[in-house]
Interface confidence: medium
């Protein structure tokens, strides 16, 4: 397959509600009509798939109903949001982009976004 450059931010801090958003941008060499975006998590040399979506250019990304990811696309940019994160989910989140159709098939893998998740402190008991 042919290689393609994918850019993503180096570091993102999740919100107190456990939500992290980042942009995944790919340098499309052709006129793809069908793109597949996969988010991979790398922690302790283990790589696991977090979520994946295939979309037609100009349409919304559709993740599975039970996915922790949502996203929107605009041109060669995909805005990804991962929800329900906890401190234990801190790790390197890698954006993988595949130009599925029409040929030629291109594959691009980003360097990863380090997402830091800090569990919120429980509220102290109130006296009143």
């Amino acid at each position: 397959c042919k290689a393609m450059h994918v850019a993503q931010p180096a570091v993102v801090l999740a919100s107190s509600r456990g939500i992290a958003s980042f942009v995944c941008e790919y340098a499309s060499p052709g006129k793809a009509t069908e793109v597949r975006v996969t988010v991979l998590r790398q922690a302790d040399s283990q790589v696991t798939e977090v979520c994946a979506a295939t979309y037609m250019m100009g349409n919304e990304l559709t993740f599975l109903d039970d996915s922790i990811c949502t996203g929107t696309s605009s041109g060669n940019q995909v805005n990804l949001t991962i929800q329900g994160l906890r401190a234990m989910d801190t790790g390197l989140y890698i954006c993988k982009v595949e130009l599925m159709y029409p040929p030629p098939y291109y594959l691009g893998i980003g360097n990863g976004t380090q997402i830091y998740v800090i569990d919120p402190e429980p509220c102290p008991d109130s006296d009143f």
Epitope: C1, T33, E34
Partner: antibody, heavy 118, light 107 residues
Framework: EVQLVESGGGLVRPGRSLKLSCAAS????????MSWVRQSPEKRLEWVAE????????YHSDTVTGRFTISRDNAKNTLYLEMSSLKSEDTAIYYC???????????WGQGTSVTVSS | DIQMTQTTSSLSASLGDRVTITCRTS??????LNWYQVKPDGTVKLLIY???RLHSGVPSRFSGSGSGTDYSLTISNLEPEDVATYYC?????????FGGGTKLEIK
């Protein structure tokens, strides 16, 4: 030399099942997406299904979705098409094809004939 | 789905002739078009890809051209082994679709 050899065709009753195989040689099978295309008795060509090089993604035409399943075994260099609930309109010569990086279907097998008739 | 129309279903030409087979698409496909040759024995070969690029091993008497929605395959200096049915196919949008074919015979 790229070679694709289909097998498994034959005469089958409507509603029954059949599994086609395609043995690939002469290239690194696991590097290529593969497709099935059929030619009807009226000589029309119709794309049936495609599977990605790793087997992770597959696509089927609307006419066969839910009835046909494309799969592959990269260890055996073999492509499959599992056909169920066969109809008379599925009668055709089924070709296994390789999808090049830059292209669609650059090499085709010799075809295997499937006849669905009572 | 994109519809592919080959208006000439069959044609007859003499050896040495120059023959042109045409194909029209229902949508602009930006040159994502292939031409295939299907011999009477069922053998299928890719001739031309991306509208005008010659596939490896295909004689240079085959050529392709076109843009937008109108495409053509030209065979110059027709030879006996060119007897076959020729199909255009688009791969700009899934699903890939084929024309109805043009059967070429020798006079």
């Amino acid at each position: 030399e790229v070679q694709l050899v289909e097998s498994g065709g034959g005469l089958v009753r409507p509603g029954r099942s059949l599994k086609l195989s395609c043995a690939a040689s002469g290239f690194t099978f696991s590097n290529y997406a593969m497709s099935w295309v059929r030619q009807s008795p009226e000589k029309r060509l119709e794309w049936v299904a495609e599977i990605s090089y790793s087997g992770t993604y597959s696509y089927h035409s609307d006419t066969v979705t839910g009835r046909f399943t494309i799969s592959r075994d990269n260890a055996k260099n073999t492509l499959y098409l599992e056909m169920s609930s066969l109809k008379s309109e599925d009668t055709a010569i089924y070709y296994c094809t390789r999808r090049d990086y830059d292209n669609e279907m650059d090499y085709w097998g010799q075809g295997t004939s499937v006849t669905v008739s009572s | 789905d994109i519809q592919m129309t080959q208006t000439t279903s069959s044609l007859s030409a003499s050896l040495g002739d120059r023959v042109t087979i045409t194909c029209r698409t229902s949508q602009v496909i930006t040159n994502y078009l292939n031409w295939y040759q299907v011999k009477p024995d069922g053998t299928v070969k890719l001739l031309i890809y991306y509208t005008s690029r010659l596939h490896s091993g295909v004689p240079s008497r085959f050529s392709g051209s076109g843009s937008g929605t109108d495409y053509s395959l030209t065979i110059s200096n027709l030879e006996p082994e060119d007897v076959a049915t020729y199909y255009c196919q688009q791969f700009g949008k899934r699903p890939p679709t084929f024309g109805g074919g043009t059967k070429l015979e020798i006079k």
